[in-house]
């Protein structure tokens, strides 16, 4: 396997705590935003087949040595890279070894199979925000706030591949109350579990909760986009959400196919193929320029699935910000 990355402490070489090499020193990776796309790249790099999970690195024995440093705060892969080194990485600024990232791949030499995902965030804007619901015996149940914690939210976000937990224990709006049976309360997750179902809890269905105590969780949505500055939601300067920050997209290589994917993703019909002059009427953006050299086939359902340079890498100014006009 490559000298720059390895998995340590697992049952086989394709699972364990993630360790990377920097300047001849092996260290760990913080699990901030660590998700299934990052694991997919790691598994590919190690020749370990498909990704099957994002367990906490602390599960693997022996634990990281005290002198071993957390070297990377976060890794953000699109999932198409060949190595972790090609993904955007953030230098460590605050992370403990109990937040070490872990990974499990479908070891080609074993019959290891992934645990099916039996959790969802319902009635929210996108699959990374919403009311927590858990599947048990083919039935979806809500989860009571009693005993719910940040650690439990962290498990849910990791299980869904939604990055870090950014909000928990918020009451659901009335329109987002559950109508399903209440599954359980008194969740006591350590935060290290691979799935919410692995957390100890009170007995199934036995609680005194009401639906106004349903738990709402918001995770850092891995990707979102919007059109700003137009007179409706279907026209304007394109902005994408990455790491919780909105940024613009450079127009290098941008064309009709890319327009179509954006309009499709936003549910805004077809692109009106605006002229260069029409595109410029929304003005330049400010802040980050997140994407450059975006290449779509036109078949993608999301701009996230298109090829592009690594997040934040570009040779553009805001004068080159992309604007899109859809039929609405």
């Amino acid at each position: 396997s490559p000298s720059g990355v390895r998995l340590v402490g697992g049952l086989h070489r394709c699972e364990g705590r993630v360790e990377v090499e920097q300047k001849g020193q092996w260290g760990t990776v913080c699990d901030d935003g660590w998700d299934i796309k990052d694991v997919a790249v790691l598994c590919r790099e190690l020749g370990c087949g498909a990704a099957s999970g994002t367990p906490s690195g602390i599960l693997y024995e022996p634990p990281a040595e005290k002198e071993q440093k957390v070297l990377i705060q976060s890794v953000s892969c699109t999932g198409t890279e060949d190595t972790l080194a090609q993904c955007e990485q953030e230098e460590v600024y605050d992370c403990s070894h109990d937040e070490d990232a872990g990974a499990s791949c479908e070891n080609p030499e074993s019959s290891f199979s992934p645990v099916p995902e039996g959790v969802r965030l319902a009635d929210g804007p996108g699959h990374c925000k919403g009311r927590v619901e858990v599947k048990h015996q083919n039935q979806w149940y809500t989860v009571c706030q009693t005993g719910w914690s940040l650690r439990a939210a962290k498990v849910v976000c990791r299980q869904l591949g939604c990055g870090r937990a950014v909000l928990t224990q918020k009451r659901c709006n009335k329109h987002a109350y559950g109508r399903k049976p209440i599954w359980l309360s008194q969740m006591s997750c350590s935060g290290r579990e691979a799935t919410l179902q692995d957390c100890p809890s009170g007995p199934w269905g036995k609680n005194t909760c009401n639906h106004d105590e349903d738990t709402w969780v918001e995770c850092e949505d891995p990707f979102d986009l919007r059109l700003v500055g137009g007179d409706n939601l279907c026209s304007g300067r394109l902005e994408v959400l990455h790491k919780g920050v909105w940024g613009s997209v450079c127009d290098d290589n941008w064309g009709e196919k890319e327009d179509q994917v954006v309009c499709k993703q936003l549910g805004c019909g077809k692109s009106l193929s605006p002229s260069f002059r029409d595109r410029k009427c929304y003005g330049p953006g400010v802040g980050r320029i997140w994407l450059d050299n975006v290449r779509c086939s036109g078949e993608e359902q999301s701009l996230e699935q298109c090829q592009h340079r690594f997040w934040g890498f570009h040779d553009c100014t805001h004068q080159e910000d992309v604007a899109v006009i859809c039929s609405g």
Epitope: G27, T28, D32, A64, E65, K66, E67, Q68, K69, V70, Q73, E90, E91, V92, Y93, D94, C95, S96, H97, R164, V166, L167, E220, K243, G244, V245
Partner: antibody, heavy 121, light 109 residues
Framework: QSVKESGGDLVKPGASLTLTCTAS????????MCWVRQAPGKGLEYIGY??????THYASWAKGRFTISKTLSTTVTLQMTSLTDADTATYFC?????????????????WGPGTLVTVSS | ELVMTQTPSSASEPVGGTVTIKCQAS??????LAWFQQKPGQPPKLLIY???TLESGVSSRFKGSGFGTEFTLTISDLECADAATYYC???????????FGGGTDVVVK
């Protein structure tokens, strides 16, 4: 371990000034250093930082006029240009905790006593 | 740019009382928040880091809590020596800076 700021002075509007933060008992190779200022009777105001890797970040109002750099393994400087009355303040440098048993702590647990910069004609 | 909003701007409580200070971040900063105490003519002193971890040597009367965007510092059994200005500070992310709240002046009667 300690840090100490120096270079504070009385200067005229439009002048430039460089402040120095000197470490004692450690070096800056594994820590992030932050500059903060406090105008008389006012709150703490973040200026910017330089990380152990040399990456810098500035508050939006400080970009262009303030520059943070590492000159030696034990000194960090803050260069200030086009000073105005509004820059009159005590300037602090602070060090983050850095690595402890392999974990990295980003809280600022070590502060200097501060150095006073007065801008007045 | 990240904004930290601290409330109240001042608080006055008797000896033995309790003061609660709140800090709200304009976007999630997970648990990367510190609380400082500052007395006139002195640099800030770290009380709490990672939102709820007590700094070594700091009295357990100081308690921090919160995650994401909402944080609280509670000072119980107030003593005269607690009279000071208290600040929250975010230290999240390499691109977010290390922003302070506006401060809370605590008077102990």
């Amino acid at each position: 371990q300690s840090v100490k700021e120096s270079g504070g002075d009385l200067v005229k509007p439009g002048a430039s000034l460089t402040l120095t933060c000197t470490a004692s008992g450690f070096d800056f190779s594994s820590n992030t250093m932050c500059w903060v200022r406090q105008a008389p009777g006012k709150g703490l105001e973040y200026i910017g930082y330089i990380s152990y890797s040399g990456a810098t970040h500035y508050a939006s109002w400080a970009k262009g006029r303030f520059t943070i750099s590492k000159t030696l393994s034990t000194t960090v400087t803050l260069q200030m240009t086009s000073l105005t009355d509004a820059d009159t303040a005590t300037y602090f440098c602070a060090r983050d905790r850095g690595y402890v048993d392999g974990s990295y702590y980003g809280d600022f647990n070590l502060w200097g006593p501060g150095t006073l910069v007065t801008v007045s004609s | 740019e990240l904004v930290m909003t601290q409330t109240p701007s001042s608080a006055s409580e008797p000896v033995g009382g309790t003061v609660t200070i709140k800090c709200q971040a304009s976007q999630s900063i997970a648990s990367r928040l510190a609380w400082f105490q500052q007395k006139p003519g002195q640099p800030p002193k770290l009380l709490i880091y990672r939102a709820s971890t007590l700094e070594s040597g700091v009295s357990s009367r100081f308690k921090g809590s919160g995650f994401g965007t909402e944080f609280t510092l509670t000072i119980s059994d107030l003593e005269c020596a607690d009279a000071a200005t208290y600040y929250c500070q975010s230290y999240y992310g390499s691109g977010y800076g290390k922003t302070f709240g506006g401060g809370t002046d605590v008077v102990v009667k």
